[in-house]
């Protein structure tokens, strides 16, 4: 951004900039951010025995250290490495569920199918889900007024870099058959510019990942079209196949029914195929 250029070119200290310069286009840090992160960490480690060894104060210190006192348009993946190290967690093979533009359904699904995991079911994703945060250069303050917007201000902001970092790691550690939920109601069912399309797809490891199974989620109730034939799905298939990973696509024609049948497979409406 222009501000970034000024900062770099003139090498001026952040606190020397006039106050109006600190106004970003995005909403500010979520209120009670430190308390929320700490509380989520405690709750998560209580519910997940395999993460009971995690010291939540250390997690918060590492999280804070990634963005506090740093120019919020100059955050790097390196800044988050101490946090990533503390939050190291593995998903069993065949149990990774990625998603793109359909977060709510993906989360509803993993709440029912408890042995599958989205990034937000892991500690670091759980801590940050739906939160915004940023700091200010050379102060220990958290900026509750505004934070950089990915489009209008800069892409290397604390929130975007966090999700890029943990998404990359989540994809890198996936193994077996990896699943992804895609939104069949969007004009681009597969979007190369989404986190899935730009980060996760390219960080699946062919030596560990046997296949990517895409679930295209239909929006219309009576929509029986084969959305697996969509040009963007063919594009995804091409990208994945070139990476020596097998690709398979499934239509989820009625997501409500699918969820219901995963939850209650003995339900009479789930007992006969047509």
């Amino acid at each position: 951004s222009g501000l970034n250029d000024i900062f770099e070119a003139q090498k001026i200290e952040w606190h020397e900039l006039p106050r109006w310069r600190q106004q970003w286009s995005g909403s500010g840090t979520t209120s009670r951010f430190p308390e929320t992160v700490l509380a989520r960490c405690v709750k998560y480690t209580e519910v997940h025995p395999e993460m009971r060894h995690v010291d939540c104060q250390s997690v918060w210190d590492a999280f804070k250290g990634a963005f506090i006192s740093k120019y919020p348009c100059n955050i790097t993946e390196e800044d988050y490495q101490p946090l990533v190290k503390l939050g190291t967690q593995t998903v069993p093979c065949n149990k990774t569920l990625l998603w793109s533009r359909i977060k709510d359904l993906a989360h509803q699904f993993t709440q029912v199918q408890r042995d599958m995991f989205t990034l937000e079911d892991m500690l670091l994703g759980y801590l940050a889900d739906d939160l915004t945060w940023c700091g200010e250069f050379n102060t220990f303050e958290i900026n509750y007024q505004s934070c950089p917007d990915w489009r209008k201000d800069c892409s290397n902001n604390p929130v975007s870099v966090f999700w890029k970092t943990v998404s990359r790691r989540f994809a890198e550690t996936a193994c077996g058959v990896v699943h992804v939920m895609l939104n069949g109601s969007r004009s681009k069912i597969f979007d190369k510019n989404s986190t899935f399309g730009s980060v996760e797809v390219h960080n699946l490891q062919p030596e560990k990942v046997q296949a990517l199974e895409a679930w295209v989620i239909h929006g219309g109730r009576e929509d029986s079209r084969d959305l697996c034939q969509d040009p963007t799905i063919k594009e995804l298939e091409s990208i994945i196949s070139k990476r020596n990973i097998r690709f398979f696509c499934k239509n989820i024609y009625r997501p409500d029914k699918f969820l219901q049948c995963v939850k209650n497979p003995e339900d009479s409406s789930c007992l006969s195929g047509i």
């Epitope: 065949n94 296949a211 097998r246 398979f248 499934k250 989820i252 049948c261 789930c270």
Partner: antibody
Framework: QSVEESGGRLVTPGTPLTLTCTVS????????MGWVRQAPGKGLKYIGI?????NIYYANWAKGRFTISKTSTTVDLRITSPTTEDTATYFC??????????????????WGQGTLVTVSS | AYDMTQTPASVEAAVGGTVTIKCQAS??????LNWYQQKPGQPPKLLIY???TLAFGVPSRFKGSGSGTEYTLTISGVESADAATYYC????????????FGGGTEVVVK
């Protein structure tokens, strides 16, 4: 509607062999066709499948060893370089998609009688 | 993968008795489980699909049940004609074919 395999015979190791699955009353643009084999006294083993849209999926173990192709009424299975381990009865079967639980799956609902391939020197 | 494990490999049953065959998938196949019957010298014949739906013409003594990763084929009132080998197969993902059939269960009728 019927499915019939042909082309099975005695071949020497390394001699390519093509098996043909001929369908009658089945539109190959509407149905997928799978090849399954069964070694003497052993279980069923999926080799690969040709989808109605022309996609071909192979089992990992079968990649490079077999090639599937189709015409309007046949689906061929080429054994590129047979070994004695490829001695088996080869079945062709129609895969039928069906709906259930808000999504779909498949079943092999129509099978041929099979054709026997013996690989021996 | 979707690896199918079938047990037992062989089972004996008296005429009129009951046989139970189990099939376990390495991950959920959401009820898309098929059962086939194969008699010596014949191709497999579809018995049950979608875990519990009987294929056309299959007698009601054959019953399929289960969900998620665990499935069962039960033959009640076994007849001598039921002597055969039975296979389960996952029908959820036909793009991943390795081990998509179970190893088979031979049913011997005494």
């Amino acid at each position: 509607q019927s499915v019939e395999e042909s082309g099975g015979r005695l071949v020497t190791p390394g001699t390519p062999l093509t098996l043909t699955c001929t369908v009658s009353g089945i539109d190959l643009n509407s149905y997928a066709m799978g090849w399954v084999r069964q070694a003497p006294g052993k279980g069923l083993k999926y080799i690969g499948i040709m989808t109605s849209g022309g996609n071909i999926y192979y089992a990992n173990w079968a990649k490079g060893r077999f090639t599937i192709s189709k015409t309007s009424t046949t689906v061929d299975l080429r054994i590129t370089s047979p070994t004695t381990e490829d001695t088996a009865t080869y079945f062709c079967a129609r895969e039928r998609e069906f709906y259930g639980g808000g999504t779909s799956g498949s079943r092999l609902d129509l099978w041929g009688q099979g054709t026997l391939v013996t690989v021996s020197s | 993968a979707y690896d199918m494990t079938q047990t037992p490999a062989s089972v004996e049953a008296a005429v009129g008795g009951t046989v139970t065959i189990k099939c376990q998938a390495s991950q959920s196949i959401y009820n898309f489980l098929n059962w086939y019957q194969q008699k010596p010298g014949q191709p497999p014949k579809l018995l049950i699909y979608y875990a519990s739906t009987l294929a056309f013409g299959v007698p009601s003594r054959f019953k399929g049940s289960g969900s998620g990763t665990e499935y069962t084929l039960t033959i009640s009132g076994v007849e001598s004609a039921d002597a055969a080998t039975y296979y389960c197969q996952q029908g959820w993902n036909s793009g991943i074919l390795d081990n998509s059939f179970g190893g088979g269960t031979e049913v011997v009728v005494k």
